[in-house]
């Protein structure tokens, strides 16, 4: 039950996180005009990864896309790439995790297969979250650098009369959305990995020892008292549902959780 809850919660948290990463990537307010210690302008500038916008005090907003690819700063391209990679990995992770959910039955999919898929999606969510956090942080660092550079030569003019006030940009809402969303995706991924440990079959380094009694066979497993009796069709690799113990053949057929650590 706890495993299902952890897996379900991990999925939901990751889903919210990835939705946030997509929202942040599409948002126009990655950087916004710094209004502190600046003359009050009737024009407000803000920029996103894909376009820059100007909102006039009249209420009119004009946005212009960055229609060049080569002319854009390498850092901006890198941020775009990180966010897209984050979205793609997250989307694939979501797709995989849907099939991995314990509460969803798909044919005769084994728990160990679901464990593998849960771990895979968890890792994808972790990488997706890290990509988003890295992308947002690179952009934030770029803003901080530019902010202090523009502050250093903010007022330029001749004869003491101020001619130009340079527009400075500060953190926009998208950065905070991106950080939170990346964090949520990361947490969701960790929860999926934790859930995977619960889903994966318990295995020790010892081989199961079979003792043959007259009339039927019982496979004893170290560390627990659950067994599969060998009457009739039960002698085949049949799953026991209480506690996740497996017959000897079944245990050997699938990788253990230690293969992924």
């Amino acid at each position: 039950m706890a495993v299902t809850a952890c897996q379900g919660l991990g999925f939901v948290v990751s889903l919210i996180g990835i939705a946030g990463i997509i929202a942040a990537t599409c948002m126009d307010q990655w950087s916004t005009q710094d209004l502190y210690n600046n003359p009050v302008t009737a024009v407000f500038n803000y920029q996103g990864l894909w376009r820059s916008c100007v909102r006039e005090s009249s209420g009119f907003t004009e946005c212009r896309g960055y229609f060049t690819l080569l002319g854009l700063p390498a850092m901006l391209q890198a941020v775009r790439a990180l966010m897209i990679v984050g979205i793609v990995l997250g989307a694939i992770g979501l797709l995989v995790s849907i099939f991995a959910l314990k509460c969803i039955r798909i044919g005769s999919m084994e728990d160990s297969a679901k464990a593998n898929m849960t771990l895979t999606s968890g890792i994808m969510f972790i990488v997706s979250g890290l990509c988003a956090i890295a992308g947002v942080s690179v952009f934030a660092n770029m803003l901080v650098t530019n902010f202090w550079m523009s502050t250093a030569n903010m007022y330029t003019g001749m004869g003491g009369m101020v001619q130009t006030v340079q527009t400075r940009y500060t953190f926009g809402a998208a950065l905070f959305v991106g950080w939170v969303a990346g964090g949520l995706t990361l947490i969701g991924g960790v929860m999926m990995c934790i859930a995977c440990r619960g889903l994966a079959p318990e295995e020790t380094n010892y081989k199961a020892v079979s003792y043959h009694a007259s009339g039927h066979s019982v496979a004893y497993k170290p560390g627990g008292f659950k067994a599969s009796t060998g009457f009739g069709s039960n002698t085949k690799n049949k799953k026991i549902y209480d506690g996740g113990a497996r017959t000897e053949d079944e245990v050997q057929s699938y990788p253990s959780k230690h293969d992924y650590v």
Epitope: T41, V43, E56, S57, F60, V165
Partner: antibody
Framework: EVMLVESGGGLVKPGGSLKLSCAAS????????MSWVRQTPEKRLEGVAT????????YYPDSVKGRFTISRDNAKNSLYLQMSSLRSEDTAVYYC???????????WGQGTSVTVSS | DIVMTQSPSSLTVTAGEKVTMSCKSS????????????LTWYQQKPGQPPKLLIY???TRESGVPDRFTGSGSGTDFTLTISSVQAEDLAVYYC?????????FGAGTKLELK
């Protein structure tokens, strides 16, 4: 057709108060930033107050700050200018105007005259 | 506050003549975000409110004859009337639409010779 009609002007003593009104029609008033502009007897133009469309921002020059208050009632399509502690230099024709592209004042009323004199 | 300086204060012209008037601002009105200059030109005839002619320093308002042309960038701006007509006799004001408070120039009065 866009129409802006000012009212409320008149003769007032120094230190007195007056409330100007502007009735708007023919455009989406609630989505428009609005301004009050005055023209002195010497024909100089001065923006005295601006209010954003969402009612979130108001701007005043230092000459009227603390004395004038701009407000709007989107339900009534009306703009107001509450003037207090009036001085002789506030004597002017007060125009109500709408802000358009480039923050330019694209539509103006005919104006209402305010005279501050003892 | 931004100071808007218009020159000359008055111009005496003959019909059909080309006229230019200047407007200088104490700070640049160029917005780096959209590369537009937030300078506006108005025309005011006696007994009437000002009428919008040009915004963004060079964009003509709809219905304004194409003999009116706005130019300039940063701090220096010009309004040109290619061929003055009798109905153009008025006072022309420039306005800073970038910084609050939105300030006006003192005006250039266009008179007929």
């Amino acid at each position: 057709e866009v129409m802006l009609v000012e009212s409320g002007g008149g003769l007032v003593k120094p230190g007195g108060s007056l409330k100007l009104s502007c009735a708007a029609s023919g455009f989406s008033f609630s989505n428009s930033a609005m301004s009050w502009v005055r023209q002195t007897p010497e024909k100089r133009l001065e923006g005295v107050a601006t209010i954003s469309s969402g009612d979130s921002y108001t701007y005043y020059p230092d000459s009227v700050k603390g004395r004038f208050t701009i407000s709007r009632d989107n339900a009534k399509n009306s703009l107001y200018l509450q003037m207090s502690s009036l001085r002789s230099e506030d004597t002017a024709v007060y125009y109500c105007a709408r802000q358009g592209y480039g923050n330019a004042l694209d539509y103006w009323g005919q104006g209402t005259s305010v005279t501050v004199s003892s | 506050d931004i100071v808007m300086t218009q020159s000359p204060s008055s111009l005496t012209v003959t019909a059909g003549e080309k006229v230019t008037m200047s407007c200088k601002s104490s700070q640049s009105l160029l917005n780096s975000g959209n590369q537009k200059n937030y300078l506006t030109w108005y025309q005011q005839k006696p007994g009437q409110p000002p009428k919008l002619l040009i915004y963004w320093s060079s964009t003509r308002e709809s219905g304004v004859p194409d003999r009116f042309t706005g130019s300039g960038s940063g701090t220096d701006f010009t309004l040109t009337i290619s061929s003055v007509q009798a109905e153009d006799l008025a006072v022309y004001y420039c306005q800073n639409d970038y910084y609050y408070p939105l300030t006006f120039g003192a005006g250039t009065k266009l008179e007929l010779k």
